[in-house]
Interface confidence: low
């Protein structure tokens, strides 16, 4: 019985289509596939960014897979090919690894790229992006920023800069079509006349960087003697009322602190008939059902009541 | 290493003007704005303005709109500012001090040049 | 223009303790993310020194005893352990918006 034998795929490399970290790995079928003209060869296919402990792996019958990758550090990559048992009379045969990497020679040391970025993606419309440039870089150091998400054809620079003393630290973005629930990906580099300056990129969806606006039109009724419902309504904006969670701050009589996070846009609040004063704030926040991540919104205006019966039926500000 | 030069005292009569100066060495002078700031004795600090040296853009506060000058001589590295209409409220120590940019302060600072206006 | 009020005026505390210095904007001094905060320290005889900038950054050189905090319109400067050294004027600057303002300073004595 001579053993069967197959050889790891050709070509196997890793190529930058200029997208800011979503790069295409790419190969081409082992030599002397002829004695398996019969058989549907398999690759099994590893690969990380250098450094991360684990692998992700996909076995697939194409010749090319695309991932994102952090392209502040290296990628590497291996593959191998699969013959299954049918094609092997009883075991599955693979072939020697195939190996290769890939990473963007870095410039400049690293205190010189750009410093706590920070993108917030306000009422799930407008994106903004921050930055504090790099530690002890000059006046005449510029950055630009770069971006792409999955539905544009290349990446795009950004057209209206933030800037302080004539350098740029953050970018308005204009409408973003289609762009949530994909990976978004941003490079920050620089330029200087008297030294190299270190790229930064980042990658994030941006349904998990929104930060809504505050609740508005809040509201008191009286539900019972001893009940009181706290409404309030949804900003005005994309976002729908399913994707909100609520924070509420209720104050009584300046003694109490009652905190308390819900789905809805109302919360009843137990009260006594000696309460002289109520007073609440609501914030909201995207929930885990359209998000990740989110972040909380400003506190509303505050609504008050004081000094009447709060038998009232309403009492609105 | 960084350093600011200024004389160290002025006397002025009131009514008159002085020009001050202040010698920039250790750095590029064009990447870093000069500030200018004001501290009478036993008082606080009072920010007068910046200049960039560069391309000569200058920010004033409006307090000394009308008092500060701001200019530059960037072939000898130096910045300058006149003061005019000098009164006794004038007299009091003067600093430069560089700044690279608006969140970064100011990080090196000149030793002062004490101006007494007197008749 | 946005005033600066620091407290307290003046303080004395013990070598090895920690001293706290306050400042309050009449506005926020945060945009863009940043702090735009800065603190100075004036011995008699000299020029302000860089102690801190963007609230809570480290000018060069300086030693890791003294710290900064706080965003919006409330900041604080601290130094931990105090030495004899420390003994000076401190001042807390805003560089938010032109005019930059300073704080109206807080003299530290050491017992």
């Known amino acids: 019985d001579t053993e069967i034998k197959v050889n790891p795929p050709q070509d196997f490399e890793i190529v930058d289509p200029g997208y800011l970290g979503y790069l295409y790995l790419q190969w081409q079928p082992p030599l002397s596939l002829d004695h398996f003209k019969e058989c549907t060869v398999e690759y099994e296919l590893k690969y990380r960014n250098i450094g991360s402990e684990t692998w992700k792996t996909i076995i697939t019958k194409n010749l090319h897979y695309k991932d994102g990758f952090d392209l502040n550090k290296g990628i590497e990559a291996k593959i191998h090919t699969l013959l299954p048992w049918q094609c092997t009379n009883g075991s599955e045969v693979q072939s020697s690894w195939a190996e290769t990497t890939y990473w963007i020679s870095p410039q400049g040391i690293p205190e010189t790229k750009v410093q706590d970025m920070d993108c917030v993606y306000y009422n799930w419309q407008y994106l903004l992006c921050s930055w504090k440039p790099g530690i002890g870089v000059l006046l005449d150091t510029n950055y630009n920023l770069f971006y792409w998400y999955e539905g544009l054809d290349h990446a795009l620079q950004c057209v209206d800069y933030i800037k302080a003393d004539g350098q740029n630290i953050g970018c308005r973005f204009p409408y973003l079509e289609a762009s949530d629930y994909k990976d978004f990906y941003i490079c920050v580099n620089g330029s200087s006349e008297n030294k190299p300056i270190r790229s930064s990129y980042f990658t994030f969806q941006l349904q998990n960087i929104v930060k809504p606006l505050p609740p508005v039109y809040l509201t008191f009724t009286r539900e019972s003697s001893c009940e009181i419902k706290l409404k309030w309504s949804i900003p005005l904006g994309p976002i729908p009322a399913r994707c909100f969670d609520y924070e509420i701050e209720i104050r009584e009589d300046d003694t109490t602190l009652v905190t308390a996070t819900v789905e809805n846009e109302t919360y009843t609040l137990k009260t006594t008939n000696e309460t002289r004063q109520l007073c609440f704030v609501v914030r909201s926040k995207v929930n885990i059902y359209c998000s990740d991540d989110g972040i909380w919104s400003e506190w509303s205006d505050k609504q008050c009541w004081e000094g009447e019966d709060l038998s009232k039926k309403t009492l609105l500000r | 290493q960084v350093q600011l030069q200024q004389p160290g005292a002025e006397r002025v009569r009131p009514g008159a003007s002085v020009k001050l100066s202040c010698k920039a060495s250790?750095?590029?002078?064009?990447?870093?704005?000069m500030n200018w700031v004001k501290q009478r004795p036993e008082q606080g600090l009072e920010w007068i303005g910046r200049?960039?040296?560069?391309?000569?853009?200058?920010h004033y506060n409006q307090k000394f709109k009308d008092k500060a000058i701001l200019t530059v001589d960037k072939s000898s590295s130096t910045a300058y500012m006149q003061l005019r209409s000098l009164t006794s409220e004038d007299s009091a120590v003067y600093y430069c001090a560089r700044g690279y940019g608006d969140s970064y302060g100011m990080d090196h600072w000149g030793q002062g040049t004490s101006v007494t206006v007197s008749s | 223009d946005i005033v600066l009020t620091q407290s307290p005026a003046s303080l004395a505390v013990s070598l090895g303790q920690r001293a706290t210095i306050s400042c309050r904007a009449s506005?926020?001094?945060?945009?863009?993310?940043?702090?735009?905060m800065n603190w100075f320290q004036q011995k008699p005889g000299q020029p302000p020194k860089l102690l801190i900038y963007?609230?809570?950054r480290q000018g060069s050189g300086d030693p890791a005893r003294f710290s900064g905090s706080g965003s919006g319109t409330d900041f604080s400067l601290n130094i931990h352990p105090l030495e004899e050294d420390d003994t000076a004027m401190y001042f807390c600057q805003q560089s938010k918006e032109v005019p930059w303002t300073f704080g109206g300073g807080t003299k530290l004595e050491i017992k």
């Open positions: 963007a609230a809570s």
């Open positions: 506005e926020s001094v945060d945009n863009y993310g940043i702090s735009f």
């Open positions: 200049i960039d040296p560069y391309a000569g853009e200058t």
């Open positions: 250790g750095y590029t002078f064009t990447n870093y704005w």
